[in-house]
């Protein structure tokens, strides 16, 4: 269930555009990332597309929003409360925030200045 | 690295029992731990979670209201509080490392709790 | 609740032949993020449980490589493809998708 968000602006607007852009790509190109570093000594490829893939398909998604710089941070923010129960230790949570407010300018879009990924009523 | 339980024992229908479990060799305050036992005979049945900061505890549905885990970073241990203990509470209680992506990737060698009269 | 099913129960096994063991959950272990929340763990007798395989088909470290997960979704395989000696013990399937359920194991012995 999708908390409060009460952000100041336009939160409306942007929650309506969150909901309709599919966030599924970023969270499994985040997922990727982080465990590429723990898959170094496996023979096995556990992921079904690449993260470059995954990575395109996550900016295409995100480009859907009209107002990218400003509803970025609730797109963030969204994935973050997606996967944070995924996410058992401090190292995780906090390689899964940086991946996160890496993800704009991945996606050649402006970061947003201020966001806070502390959210999911403190789960996270 | 590894983990050391401590605390079983025998104890009667409706009395209660603390197992303790020392951590070293890793950052213990950074990681989520579990409680997972084992019946004579039977298989594994995980028991309790609790998250590296305590903001989440979870457990089985059959201990709850009778069993709290807890954690003190300060001293790398983790406790399993267990009260109301009956027959079926009979088991071999493994305190379990969560990797931090929700899989166990170092288990202690367990202890013993029997539960009779 | 998840509930976890393996097959078979036991497994009397020839060194040097391959070996599979199945498991099914009540409902799908993919999660929004692309994983398959489904580990596979052996517990060798007279020890503790040791980690095999995580996220449906990834190898844990030290785990020799005749050892291999695959399935999506509900249906999940380990493979040996030669079964050594020291791989007897009791092998479990486990999800931790939602919360965490181990099926009811599968006894792998020597013929």
């Known amino acids: 269930m999708r908390r409060e968000r009460g952000r100041q602006g336009d939160s409306s607007s942007c929650e309506r555009q969150v909901d309709r852009v599919n966030l599924k790509p970023c969270e499994q190109h985040i997922m990727q990332r982080i465990m590429g570093e723990q898959e170094q000594y496996d023979s096995y490829d556990i992921r079904s597309t690449r993260s470059s893939d995954q990575q395109q398909r996550c900016c295409d998604e995100l480009n859907e929003m009209e107002n990218t710089q400003r509803c970025m941070c609730e797109a963030l923010q969204q994935i973050m409360e997606n996967q944070c129960d995924r996410l058992q230790d401090r190292q995780m949570v906090q390689q899964f925030k940086r991946e996160l407010m890496n993800l704009p300018q991945q996606c050649n879009f402006r970061a947003p200045q201020r966001c806070d990924l502390d959210v999911s009523g403190g789960r996270c | 690295v590894q983990l050391v339980e401590s605390g079983g024992g025998v104890v009667q229908p409706g009395g209660s029992l603390r197992l303790s479990c020392a951590a070293s060799?890793?950052?213990?305050?950074?990681?989520?731990m579990h409680w997972v036992r084992q019946a004579p005979g039977k298989g594994l049945e995980w028991v309790a979670f609790?998250?590296?900061?305590?903001?989440?505890?979870y457990y089985v549905d059959s201990v709850k209201g009778r069993f709290t885990v807890s954690r003190d970073n300060s001293k790398s241990t983790l406790y399993l509080q267990m009260n109301s203990l009956r027959a079926e509470d009979t088991a071999v209680y493994y305190c379990?490392?969560?990797?931090?992506?929700?899989?166990?990737?170092?288990w202690g060698r367990g202890t013993l709790v029997t539960v009779s009269s | 609740d998840i509930v976890m099913t393996q097959s078979p129960l036991s497994l009397p096994v020839t060194p040097g032949e391959p070996a599979s063991i199945s498991c099914r959950s009540s409902?799908?272990?993919?999660?929004?993020?692309?994983?398959?929340?489904l580990d596979w763990y052996l517990q060798k007798p007279g020890q503790s449980p040791q980690l095999l395989i995580y996220?449906?088909?990834n190898r844990a470290s030290g785990v020799p490589d005749r050892f291999s997960g695959s399935g999506s979704g509900t249906d999940f395989t380990l493979n040996i493809t030669r079964v050594e000696a020291e791989d007897v013990g009791v092998y479990y399937c486990?999800?931790?998708?939602?919360?965490?359920?181990f099926g009811q194991g599968t006894k792998v012995d020597i013929k």
């Open positions: 060799g890793f950052t213990f305050r950074d990681y989520g």
């Open positions: 379990v490392k969560d990797s931090g992506l929700r899989y166990f990737n170092l």
């Open positions: 609790i998250r590296y900061d305590e903001r989440n505890k």
């Open positions: 486990m999800q931790a998708l939602q919360s965490w359920t």
């Open positions: 996220f449906g088909s």
């Open positions: 409902q799908s272990l993919l999660h929004s993020n692309g994983y398959n929340y």
